[in-house]
């Protein structure tokens, strides 16, 4: 059996954060957008993801993981430089691939100690271990020695696809669920709201059936759809009210003439 090293404690456990706001709890604020953000968690001494509502909140909120780490983790830039120069890699870079307990299909990257390179793997969506990066860049920065790494290959952006075994499947028909596509989408210049409100409903990658709402920019209304429990996009709200509050405000009336091809 593949037994994982205990990677639940951060190496920086005893250190104090660099700024007082790094000690604040994650605050999603009163608004109901779903913006992926990062905060420094005082308990785990790591930067972690949370969903920001789009307004108010506090200073312990960052657009990128990197920004959060630089701001709140003492000595992070030094250790990142060390790792990049090949002098020292964090222990978690040597952990074996762990897809985790759950079975969503999420594209992630891990450092492979055999090949000495960062590689793509499919993460199940929960638990697993810290050898698990959202981007190839982040994996390379932290775990790979750039001296030995080949020049970056132009990678196809896979964010709109999921890998299922060796095949690449268009997400609009994952799990035999045909995602409702908006018949008409207003020109982007006619919609001044949040960009994800223009995205089609995406039922996601798992097998649950959860009632959610998405904003249909053609009708200016929020419609119900079945969400499978993981994956998908940000045009995904737990109530119609939240959906309308988040997306309706951006529509400029009487301007929806064209269709985006």
């Amino acid at each position: 059996l593949s037994e994982e090293a205990d990677d639940t404690d951060s190496e920086l456990g005893s250190m104090k954060p660099l700024h007082t706001f790094c000690a604040m709890k994650a605050d999603d604020g009163p608004c109901k957008a779903m913006i992926r953000s990062y905060f420094f968690n005082m308990y785990t001494h790591q930067c972690e993801e949370f969903i920001y509502g789009g307004c108010e909140g506090n200073e312990n909120r960052f657009d990128t993981l990197e920004e959060c780490k630089k701001t709140c983790i003492p000595g992070y830039e030094k250790t990142a430089v060390k790792a990049a120069s090949g002098a020292e890699r964090p222990d978690f870079c040597f952990l074996e691939e762990d897809p985790g307990l759950c079975r969503g299909y999420m594209k992630r990257y891990l450092y492979n100690n055999q090949t000495k390179q960062c590689e793509r793997f499919v993460y199940g969506g929960c638990l697993g271990n810290r050898n698990n990066f959202e981007t190839l860049d982040e994996c390379k920065k932290i775990c790979e020695n750039p001296v030995h790494s080949p020049s970056p290959v132009n990678e196809v952006q896979m964010s709109d696809y999921v890998t299922d075994g060796n095949t690449v499947t268009d997400r609009s028909t994952v799990n035999n669920i045909v995602v409702p596509q908006s018949p008409k989408v207003p020109r982007r210049r006619d919609y001044r709201g949040r960009p994800w409100c223009l995205q089609p409903a995406d039922s996601g990658l798992c097998k649950a059936s959860e009632r959610r709402f998405y904003y249909n920019s053609a009708t200016g209304k929020c419609h119900r759809f079945n969400y499978t429990g993981c994956g998908g996009n940000n045009n995904n709200f737990t109530t119609r009210r939240r959906c309308l509050r988040s997306c309706k405000t951006g529509l400029i009336k009487n301007k929806s003439k064209g269709v985006v091809k």
């Epitope: 709890k25 972690e48 969506g125 097998k207 959610r212 995904n236 737990t238």
Partner: antibody, heavy 123, light 112 residues
């Protein structure tokens, strides 16, 4: 319907090894849409997760730090069951022990539990 | 470890009346797209626990619609819209954001 049937002794002497087995029907121990866990319950500790095993092209296990040096959870694919071994037990390990299935596809939770086995550690 | 704290620890209820149980986690349990890494279980007297609510707000198979889960971040609530006699037992919340998986200390619901 998934059923988990526990077996093993209810009385173990201090410093000995606690051994329990959980027989699975209605699912496979090597299913890639499940994980198999042991959880115990005592008045002092409440529900305490001990460890889990799961198969995703190969076997994985994770254990609670509190018992990590003493615990082993193993699958037995030929009998479609999994077992718990807890070494060097003390009276503190007295509890009701449950095996449980973690549903990896839909629920993402412990959706099936064994009947529970009260294990008393006493000389 | 993520600490799960439930309140109240004991909840006397009247059949037909609503009931509410709170669960607070020591760190955020919300993942992207609104997935909440939190489950609720009910352990009826003399029985093993059973899954009630998964991913924060979704009822498990066979669970009556009088049960609902809500909350985000670190604060979660289990509500019973109209308590029935068969709902007595101990209710537990459980997180699976990180290892070790941890449970709340339980809320005992009993009929007044």
């Amino acid at each position: 319907e998934v059923q988990l049937q526990q077996s093993g002794p209810g009385l173990v002497k201090p410093s000995q090894t606690l051994s329990l087995t959980c027989a699975i029907s209605g699912d496979s121990v090597s299913s890639d849409s499940a994980a198999w866990s042991w959880i115990r319950q005592s008045p002092s500790r409440g529900l305490e997760w001990l460890g889990i095993i799961y198969y995703r092209s190969k076997w994985y296990n994770r254990y609670a730090v509190s018992v990590k040096s003493r615990i082993t959870i193993n699958p037995d694919t030929s009998k479609n069951q999994f077992s718990l071994q807890l070494n060097s037990v003390t009276p503190e390990d007295t509890a009701v022990y449950y095996c449980a299935r973690w549903h990896s596809d839909k629920h993402w939770g412990f959706d099936d539990w064994g009947q529970g086995t009260l294990v008393t550690v006493s000389s | 470890d993520i600490v799960m704290t439930q309140s109240p620890l004991s909840l006397p209820v009247t059949p037909g009346e609503p009931a509410s149980i709170s669960c607070r986690s020591s760190q955020s349990l919300v993942f992207r797209f609104g997935i909440t890494y939190l489950n609720w279980y009910l352990q009826k007297p003399g029985q093993s626990p059973q899954l009630l609510i998964y991913k924060g707000s979704n009822r498990a198979s066979g669970v009556p619609d009088r049960f609902s889960g809500s909350g985000s971040g670190t604060d979660f609530t289990l509500k019973i819209s109209r308590v029935e006699a068969e709902d007595v037992g101990v209710y537990y919340c459980q997180q699976y954001t990180s290892y070790p998986l941890t449970f709340g200390q339980g809320t005992k619901v009993e009929i007044k």
